[in-house]
Interface confidence: low
């Protein structure tokens, strides 16, 4: 390729636009992946309980795909820059194993939504919210993990349960064989509280006095955060893939044309 | 049973930082309902609340001596501390932890036995 | 803040005689829930304070039931049935309505 042709220079200025784009989005997709893993709404016990934190796993990859990418992005510009056939056969092989894991992070992210389902939560929450006799230390942990985080999100969100109080009357729980069902028919963090963290009128929480307990179910408090990050690591990361697709086939065409 | 047993430095000099550890027993922290308050006492006079940390980690600090205290607690440890910054001879007093439960209303239903604490230059 | 305002002494009792002991507030103590948020606490000599009165009129465990309270929105009133001798301290009246929370100056029952 001759490379005082203007076309050259001007295809050339093309692959460095798209690769600092890619590198720009390298680094939006690591931040929004450590937003993600470092768990700021404290929701990572309940996924952890339930034996399945792939989204997890997918936003970890991310976190790596997009320090790659910006990585990348740096060898693909210097590659073009200088025309070197090495440098660019480099970056392809590399960008090529990053893809695979990208693709890999989207579709984990993506398939994820279907497993966020309000019987996922309750299920575990029955089984495991305030279970004092668990098999092992594992479960131990993870039922005080669980525990812990109901009990913050029943307070903190003024929700009770995940579809509402009638989960803890309706199903078998560990939470009703620790406790009596007629001084605890839901638990405490159920009631209206005071500034004392008391409850309000315990009596008329108890009985179930509309004002005096938390009517309506944490579900959407749990499963929005979820999906909104899977949407994001999965959607994001689609787009990267999109635009690297092109990036990375005009560089190939590129190389192909460069001189020995 | 439960038991509550406060420590701290004994003597220390004005300006400097009152740290006092409640350890506990017989209770949990990390059960819904569940505080700790600090209470202190100057020889022969009356009691006066400091600060309160509960089971989900609100802190509940008396206005005036806010800016001073800072109120913790170690749940793995049934451990609870409070920190003075700046102190100076008035706060020479007797330092109570207690529990405070909501299914008494708040009250503190159970008292260590006090630790005395002297500030003087 | 709510002030908590008590007698420094009470009228000197005979033993297994009655004694009573009074606690003003500067505001009601009643919430609208319907719970009074009163305390009464027994500081014997040389000991820490000791629960024996929740919610105005509820006996904490372990207290005998010779002590007993009563009271509207702002005037409380402790009663000791058959004063013992174990009973000498200082009666402190408390409340936890409004942060921050507020004691008395304390009651020294007297024995004559």
């Known amino acids: 390729m001759a490379k005082d042709n203007s076309t050259v220079r001007c295809f050339q200025g093309l692959l460095i636009f798209g690769n600092v784009i890619i590198g720009c989005c390298g680094i939006a997709l690591t931040a929004e992946c450590i937003f993600f893993v470092s768990d700021q709404h404290s929701l990572y016990p309940l996924l952890e309980a339930t034996d399945n934190d792939d989204i997890y796993g997918a936003a970890w990859i991310g976190i790596f795909v997009g320090i790659c990418l910006f990585c990348l992005s740096v060898l693909g510009i210097v590659g073009i820059m200088k025309s070197s056939r090495k440098i660019l056969l480099a970056y392809f092989i590399l960008m090529f194993i990053v893809y695979a894991f990208e693709v890999a992070s989207c579709i984990t992210a993506a398939t994820q939504q279907d497993f966020f389902t309000p019987n996922l939560f309750l299920k575990q929450m029955l089984e495991r919210y305030q279970n004092n006799s668990p098999p092992n230390n594992d479960d131990q942990w993870k039922n005080n993990g669980v525990t812990k985080t109901w009990d913050r999100l029943m307070l903190q969100d003024n929700c009770c349960g995940v579809n509402g109080p009638s989960d803890w009357q309706k199903y078998t729980s560990a939470f009703r064989t620790e406790n009596n069902d007629a001084d605890y028919p839901w638990p405490r963090q159920c009631c209206v509280m005071n500034n004392l963290k008391e409850p309000l009128n315990l009596e008329a929480c108890k009985l179930g006095v509309p004002g005096f307990y938390h009517n309506q179910g944490c579900y959407e408090l749990i499963s929005g955060p979820m999906n909104r990050h899977a949407w994001g690591v999965a959607w994001f990361g689609f787009a990267i893939l999109c635009w690297t697709f092109w990036v990375l086939l005009g560089t190939m065409f590129y190389w192909s044309r460069i001189e020995y | 049973q439960i038991t509550l047993k406060e420590s701290g430095p004994g003597i220390l000099q004005p300006s400097q930082t009152l740290s006092l550890t409640c350890s506990f027993s017989?209770?949990?922290?990390?059960?819904?309902?569940?505080?700790v308050g600090w209470i202190r006492q100057p020889s022969g006079k009356g009691l006066e609340w400091l600060a309160n940390i509960w089971w989900n980690d609100d802190q509940y600090y008396n206005p005036p001596l806010k800016s001073r205290l800072t109120v913790s607690k170690d749940t793995s440890k049934t451990q609870v501390f409070l920190k003075i910054a700046h102190v100076d001879t008035a706060d020479t007093a007797t330092y109570y932890c207690?529990?405070?439960?909501?299914?008494?209303?708040?009250?503190?239903?159970?008292w260590g036995q006090g630790t005395s604490v002297t500030v003087s230059s | 803040d709510i002030v908590m305002t008590q007698a420094a002494f009470s009228n000197p009792v005979t033993l297994g005689t009655s004694a009573s002991i009074s606690c003003r507030s500067s505001?009601?103590?009643?919430?609208?829930?319907?719970?009074?948020?009163l305390y009464w606490y027994l500081q014997k000599p040389g000991q820490s304070p000791q629960l024996l009165i929740y919610?105005?009129?509820s006996l904490a465990s372990g207290v005998p039931d010779r002590f007993s309270s009563s009271g509207s929105g702002t005037d409380f009133t402790l009663r000791i049935s058959r004063v013992e001798a174990e009973d000498v301290g200082v009666y402190y009246c408390?409340?936890?309505?409004?942060?921050?929370?507020?004691f008395g100056g304390g009651t020294k029952l007297e024995i004559k």
């Open positions: 919610q105005m009129s």
């Open positions: 505001k009601s103590l009643l919430h609208s829930n319907g719970i009074t948020y």
């Open positions: 017989g209770f949990s922290l990390s059960t819904s309902g569940m505080g």
């Open positions: 408390a409340q936890s309505l409004e942060l921050p929370y507020t």
């Open positions: 207690a529990r405070i439960y909501s299914g008494n209303y708040g009250a503190m239903d159970y």
